[in-house]
Amino acid sequence: QDPWAAEPRSACGPSSCYALFPRRRTFLEAWRACRELGGDLATPRTPEEAQRVDNLVGAGPASRLLWIGLQRQARQCQLQRPLRGFTWTTGDQDTAFTNWAQPATGGPCPAQRCVALEASGEHRWLEGSCTLAVDGYLCQFGFEGACPALQDEAGQAGPAVYTTPFHLVSTEFEWLPFGSVAAVQCQAGRGASLLCVKQPEGGVGWSRAGPLCLGAGCSPDNGGCEHECVEEVDGHVSCRCTEGFRLAADGRSCEDPCAQAPCEQQCEPGGPQGYSCHCRLGFRPAEDDPHRCVDTDECQIAGVCQQMCVNYVGGFECYCSEGHELEADGISCSPAGAMGARASQDLGDELLDDGEDEEDEDEAWEAFGGGWTEMPGILWMEPTQPPDFALAYRPSFPEDREPQIPYPEPTWPPPLSAPRVPYHSSVLSVTRPVVVSATRPTLPSAHQPPVIPATHPALSRDHQIPVIAANYPDLPSAYQPGILSVSHPAQPPAHQPPMISTRYPELFPAHQSPMFPDTQVAGTQTTTHLPAIPPNRAPLVTTLGAHQPPQAPDAPVLRTQATQLPIIPTAQPSLTTSSRSPVSPAHQVSVPAATQPPALPTLLPSQSPTNQTSPISPTHPHSKVPQIPREDGPSPKLALWLPSAAPTAAPTALGEASLAEHIQRDDRWL
């Protein structure tokens, strides 16, 4: 009997497994079978993933077909798109790889279609009836981590037998997903059973360190240990590591716990986890995650500045009102003729040459949510009209030359009416407005600060914010603040708090996916986290009412209400899709930008300073709201709805906006 038709088999990498089940099933049956095992039908979106599928499927018979996780509803064909209107069963249409057997041909697409992969040759994609029971199906299983296959030991009776959480049993795995069991039989009789588990210090590893079979102790080859070998009373040997190192998952080698850069800023070996994290001056450990560092808002410390204070990532600055100048201590103000003096308390300056790379500084720029803070006793907003602030644009920097020092970046809201509430807060929270410019002009120099025209409320003569001069002789150009041009509109009505709670668009490299919102509001520090949906679990879909604002989990109530800005469509980067052409299978083609459909209207959320390069969820980049296939009934077009106050799912790096959110559930996606 042909091995292809025998037992299921799989191929695993460090974060996912593909498994081939040679069982005759319809698409729906196959989808259910994968889901029941905790996976999904395979979604090979990249050439690398496709290569793993190719290796797994091998050279099967031409007559055999395997379901993959692509389905299209009736009358949903979009032949100009890489996926031709098909949607992954994970709920989106993002792909960097296609392998259609034939070029797209025009047609009305009257019926629901599903995709099967040929078991032979180039493993081309064919579309056909979803109700056909084809020869098998490919499942994909994502997980939090994997354990490396165990090294064979001298005393073993045979290779380790592994059982995965999705019930595949084999000796051939290179990686074993979290939850797998390894059974080792020893020549001396009793064997050992190990579990791939989460380690206390993070990551996953085998539940027991080797060697597993009784051997000749430490004498031959130091018992297989990299550092120290210890012979236990029961005859087993165990490995230990010298100070500053910890035992690796294989139970033999030793690793520097700081080598994987577990800390955002500074890492020291030692401590209960094998390492401890420290933050630089001007930062403190995040309460929810001690590996991360958050800016210390020095402006919240009473008396840090005599008059006005601006906080930015890693430091703060004191300012004096017009007619006063900052004293040498950088804190006090004294009457003087000179205007606009400023002292920069950049707490990170002295650390710039301590081996830190540029990235921290770039991230600080990206993450800056600088807040103007008035010190007690200075009422600098008089009862006038609500401020009418106009924001120009956030400059675009060439990818390799972003500014290396964070500027103080006081930003002002767009012309929105502030709600009429009594003015209590001494903190003006400043975040980034959702003003998305499709074309952001590039500044000639990466170090030139942004020009931010703004209109300020009128201030009494002795309490006006100084016009900040473009150049400070005492500061190098990289440290210079943004230029603010100021004019004075009419007086606002009494008891209007300053409405400064808006967002800036971020600068994304061509194919970098924006993060889910991670919004920091100075002062009240409201953080909105949209958690990544874990793979292979149908998440709860919360539908926001048309005018209901999104709720920030566990967030303190803001003392000022922010009006939601309209959703602005954004230009998406062109999608480069790698495609195996039917004529020349290895050929990779680029889909030109012109062929891309317009993206869904999308909010570009602020990037978290610690995860700027991670698309949506670093562990499971393709985890979306899963679409559940069904095989009956007519197929109306997918209706999209965009509630006025609900953030959309972030578009992915490849430019096709995810349908995971805001899909009015179609009857045929159960």
């Epitope: 042909d2 018979p61 007559s63 019926a111 099967a116 056909g128 109700t131 056909l132 084809v134």
Partner: antibody, heavy 124, light 108 residues
Framework: QVQLVQSGAEVKKPGASVKLSCKAS????????IHWVRQTPGQRLEWMGY????????TYNQKFKGRVTITGDTSANTAYMELNSLTSEDTAVYYC?????????????????WGQGTLVTVSS | DIQLTQSPSFLSASVGDRVTITCRAS??????VAWYQQKPGKAPKLLIY???NRYTGVPSRFSGSGSGTEFTLTISSLQSEDLATYYC??????????FGQGTKLEIK
């Protein structure tokens, strides 16, 4: 071009067996499944079973279970169908047909090529 | 087993007529339906696969439609060479194929 050529007509007595052949040409024999279908005098078409010559995988219609055996000879590019315990009800034209794999980027399990048919008459 | 019922069983039409043959399935078969033409004394020939896709070399006057339980074969302008018996076939529970009883088309 693709061709399926079947063996000649057979006359059998009730209780006997018949073995029909279907020689394939014009394509790679192991790449396609061969089905057997019969057509009774009342013109009804009835599926009997298939063989995948790649691995000799076979499946039969329950109605014929135990009476029908389909085999293949890859060296001769030929499929065979043997029907035992014949009765007059088995009088029919027997066709072999190739199951298509894909047409113009579609996968489909319809039968794209048929043999010319073999008439089997069961009579005492 | 899935039953297929064709209607009409017999049809007489003139050259140039638009002819429609219907096939009803006893349960949902998606689009796993094919249509065959069988001329007297010959083997069946594939016309339409996957409910609506015309097979290579089949004249454009033949078209198929439908999904689920109701399927239609249409000959837009009948020609004299279209005299034949037409069969629908389902294969949704492959490999268990079932066929309709056939529609005999006669030219007036």
């Amino acid at each position: 071009q693709v061709q399926l050529v079947q063996s000649g007509a057979e006359v059998k007595k009730p209780g006997a067996s018949v073995k029909l052949s279907c020689k394939a040409s014009g394509y790679t024999f192991t790449d396609y499944v061969i089905h057997w279908v019969r057509q009774t005098p009342g013109q009804r078409l009835e599926w009997m079973g298939y063989i995948n010559p790649y691995d000799d995988d076979t499946t039969y219609n329950q109605k014929f279970k135990g009476r029908v055996t389909i085999t293949g000879d890859t060296s001769a590019n030929t499929a065979y169908m043997e029907l035992n315990s014949l009765t007059s009800e088995d009088t029919a034209v027997y066709y072999c047909a190739r199951r298509g794999n894909s047409y113009d980027g579609y996968f489909d399990y319809s039968m794209d090529y048929w043999g010319q048919g073999t008439l089997v008459t069961v009579s005492s | 087993d899935i039953q297929l019922t064709q209607s009409p069983s017999f049809l007489s039409a003139s050259v140039g007529d638009r002819v429609t043959i219907t096939c009803r399935a006893s349960q949902n078969v998606g689009t796993a339906v094919a249509w065959y033409q069988q001329k007297p004394g010959k083997a069946p020939k594939l016309l339409i696969y996957s409910a609506s896709n015309r097979y290579t070399g089949v004249p454009s006057r033949f078209s198929g439609s439908g999904s689920g339980t109701e399927f239609t074969l249409t000959i837009s302008s009948l020609q004299s060479e279209d005299l034949a018996t037409y069969y629908c076939q389902q294969y949704t529970n492959y490999p268990m194929y079932t066929f309709g009883q056939g529609t005999k088309l006669e030219i007036k």
